[in-house]
């Protein structure tokens, strides 16, 4: 058993049918010695008396808020949560496996630049009685500071019969140098509590591997005289690291017909302009990627040919 | 510890081309190693990230763009002095700080070159003959060093008398390649910045 926060405790259980569970001793936080009784949650049934209460925690029915009283007055509370270990592996019931970029990906993180700021998000089908707490650091043995905000509900989607909820959090490395070569990964730890179930999820990454630039901005077309060709131009996104000559991007320009089946013409360039043939009803899209370290491409910025 | 914004003549920066070749070569070699050594811990998540140049060179700090010198997190206190007769910029405007940066890059390349050559000698003794260093990568390191054209003492190739542990050597190869790829990215960024300056 360990303390998650004041008066909240996590009991780790080897989870299998007929398991013996864990013996837990609760102590009433009071100088009183006599006349103390214990109850669980809203029940008035007295579970025991005395300054300590010994319980065998086996299932969720044994978890909850234990309260010690004296003469009708509440003395203290202890909330017991359960953390299930199923055949040597901690349970992952609360969050959905996003399966991207690989199986067992519960937390996904992205950074728009090298400033040390990043966003992580996760999915769940649970709508109520759910709380998250996020901590982060650079490295784990001698951790350096990363400050994370509160996790917030960022999107709701309907997936088949289920509603899916997306939560996200923003974090910022306390002293980040955009030009630094990372040797210790960022560690992100999310504590999830649903009713009386506790779970924790972790992700470990280098900022360089989670970079996804914003789409190029100010995408414009300039028709070339006496030609079906157009000059496409764009700019680096505002959120990208500076100076741009050091943090350079490379770009992919795509001409896409109205029908998805039509052949796509693609051009790759390090410049912020390109000359392409604009077909009727087609659209021109441009996306960006770090020129020197191949992390994710940005989303497309698009303009219609007409 | 920063790069001044100099204005070299256009087309006077041969190192940019060489550094791009270097990044391509080390990335290809790393990809090959990850595929060939699939049963070894060779992914970024599995290896220890070690920097063999740590405390010996300070390329990131010496080559810091001017715009980042205001960022206190970028200003590391390590002081290292380097030889200052680089010729990558065929221009007399090469400043002391730029020379410091380029000589730091040269020292990095020299250290990696020695490590890779030593490692290749061990890998050639492996009866499995599973993986060797790409000669193209070694040649590209050499070309960039020549383009940087610094006079520096030659470092003797390390020779080891004991029987090599091929498993450890292959894991060390992965560690070296990951670190060298990261350094090659920095070198490319620096060359791109200098070229635009």
């Amino acid at each position: 058993i360990w303390e998650l926060k004041k008066d909240v405790y996590v009991v780790e259980l080897d989870w299998y049918p007929d398991a013996p569970g864990e013996m837990v001793v609760l102590t009433c936080d009071t100088p009183e010695e006599d006349g103390i009784t214990w109850t669980l949650d809203q029940s008035s049934e007295v579970l025991g008396s005395g300054k300590t209460l010994t319980i065998q925690v086996k299932e969720f029915g044994d978890a909850g808020q234990y309260t010690c009283h004296k003469g009708g007055e509440v003395l203290s509370h202890s909330l017991l949560l359960l953390h299930k270990k199923e055949d040597g592996i901690w349970s992952t019931d609360i969050l959905k496996d996003q399966k991207e970029p690989k199986n067992k990906t519960f937390l996904r993180c992205e950074a728009k630049n090298y400033s040390g700021r990043f966003t992580c998000w996760w999915l769940t089908t649970i709508s109520t009685d759910l709380t998250f707490s996020v901590k982060s650091s650079r490295g784990s043995s001698d951790p350096q500071g990363v400050t994370c905000g509160a996790a917030t509900l960022s999107a709701e989607r309907v997936r088949g019969d289920n509603k899916e909820y997306e939560y996200s959090v923003e974090c910022q490395e306390d002293s980040a140098c955009p030009a630094a070569e990372e040797s210790l990964p960022i560690e992100v730890m999310v504590d999830a509590v649903h009713k009386l179930k506790y779970e924790n999820y972790t992700s470990s990454f280098f900022i360089r591997d989670i970079i996804k630039p914003d789409p190029p901005k100010n995408l414009q077309l300039k028709p070339l005289k006496n030609s079906r060709q157009v000059e496409v131009s764009w700019e680096y996104p505002d959120t990208w690291s500076t100076p741009h000559s050091y943090f350079s991007l490379t770009f992919c320009v795509q001409v896409q017909g109205k029908s998805k089946r039509e052949k796509k013409d693609r051009v790759f360039t390090d410049k912020t302009s390109a000359t392409v043939i604009c077909r009727k009803n087609a659209s021109i899209s441009v996306r960006a990627q770090d020129r020197y370290y191949s992390s994710s491409w940005s989303e497309w910025a698009s303009v219609p040919c007409s | 510890r920063n790069l001044p914004v100099a204005t070299p003549d256009p087309g006077m920066f041969p190192c940019l081309h060489h550094s791009q070749n270097l990044l391509r070569a080390v990335s290809n070699m790393l990809q090959k190693a990850r595929q060939t050594l699939e049963f070894y811990p060779c992914t970024s998540e599995e290896i220890d990230h070690e920097d063999i140049t740590k405390d010996k060179t300070s390329t990131v700090e010496a080559c810091l763009p001017l715009e980042l010198t205001k960022n206190e997190s970028c200003l590391n206190s390590r002081e290292t002095s380097f030889i200052t007769n680089g010729s990558c910029l065929a221009s007399r405007k090469t400043s002391f700080m730029m020379a410091l940066c380029l000589s730091s890059i040269y020292e990095d390349l020299k250290m990696y070159q020695v490590e890779f050559k030593t490692m290749n000698a061990k890998l050639l003794m492996d009866p499995k003959r599973q993986i060797f260093l790409d000669q193209n990568m070694l040649a590209v390191i050499d070309e960039l060093m020549q383009a940087l054209n610094f006079n520096s003492e030659t470092v003797p190739q390390k020779s080891s008398l004991e029987e090599p542990d091929f498993y450890k050597t292959k894991i060390k190869l992965c560690i070296l390649l990951h670190a060298f790829r990261i350094r090659a990215v920095t070198i490319d960024r620096v060359m791109s910045y200098l070229n635009a300056s």
């Epitope: 989870w15 299998y16 049918p17 199923e86 055949d87 040597g88 592996i89 690989k102 199986n103 | -």
Partner: antibody
Framework: QVQLVQSGGGVVQPGRSLRLSCAAS????????MHWVRQAPGKGLEWVAF????????YYADSVKGRFTISRDNSKNTLYLQMKSLRAEDTAVYYC????????WGQGTMVTVSS | SYVLTQPPSVSGTPGQRVTISCSGG????????VKWYQQLPGTAPKLLIY???QRPSGVPDRFSGSKSGTSASLAITGVQAEDEADYYC????????????FGTGTKVTVLG
């Protein structure tokens, strides 16, 4: 004590369907994940499918994906395996089993796919 | 499609020490715990070892398990006639959990 009693096996023609059941007693069935495992005659053990305690997630072996469906009825304390488009290579003894460091197995039920 | 490899058979005379190996990889045994099962003819498998080296109550102490790196092994110290059976190791793969990964199985024969 924990008990898993299986039923539903038998002889079936290729292409036909069969449903296996596994009735649980002696524990809170709705709290635990459950597996199906099979063993072809003279062969080793092969995992078939898994279902979470609340039925929210199901996982299948590639060899049965799209043909077999694992389900559970927590109000009846019963686990099911619906098998469709059966093939000769599905011939095996099928076991249900609890998920956990200490597990309990059903007695097994024989499924023979033969024309 | 078995990823955990066991020797097809091992044998020993009563009282001898018999060991069965189970060889896997970094993503399975290297990252997860190992179980061992005993299966007597015509019966369901019976758990002998869980979490690499733990014995459930009721399993004789002549059975012991160990794990090192990407391999595990089961030892029967002082093998007895009633130990003649098939033995299977089981683990998980970190990418496909909770799918069970079983070993190829080993037939233990007690001679004489």
């Amino acid at each position: 004590q924990v008990q898993l009693v299986q039923s539903g096996g038998g002889v079936v023609q290729p292409g036909r369907s069969l449903r296996l059941s596994c009735a649980a007693s002696g524990f809170t069935f709705s709290s635990y994940g459950m597996h199906w495992v099979r063993q072809a005659p003279g062969k080793g053990l092969e995992w078939v499918a898994f279902i979470r305690y609340d039925g929210s997630n199901k996982y299948y072996a590639d060899s049965v994906k799209g043909r077999f469906t694992i389900s559970r009825d927590n109000s009846k304390n019963t686990l099911y395996l619906q098998m469709k488009s059966l093939r000769a290579e599905d011939t095996a003894v099928y076991y249900c089993k609890t998920h956990g460091s200490h597990d309990n197995w059903g007695q097994g039920t024989m499924v023979t796919v033969s024309s | 499609s078995y990823v955990l490899t066991q020797p097809p058979s091992v044998s020993g005379t009563p009282g001898q020490r018999v060991t069965i190996s189970c060889s896997g990889g970094r993503s399975n045994i290297g990252s997860n715990t190992v179980k061992w099962y005993q299966q007597l003819p015509g019966t369901a498998p019976k758990l002998l070892i869980y979490q690499n080296d733990q014995r459930p109550s009721g399993v004789p102490d002549r059975f012991s398990g160990s794990k090192s790196g990407t391999s595990a092994s089961l030892a029967i110290t002082g093998v007895q006639a009633e130990d003649e059976a098939d033995y299977y190791c089981q683990s998980y793969d970190r990418g496909t959990h909770p799918a069970l990964l079983f070993g190829t199985g080993t037939k233990v024969t007690v001679l004489g």
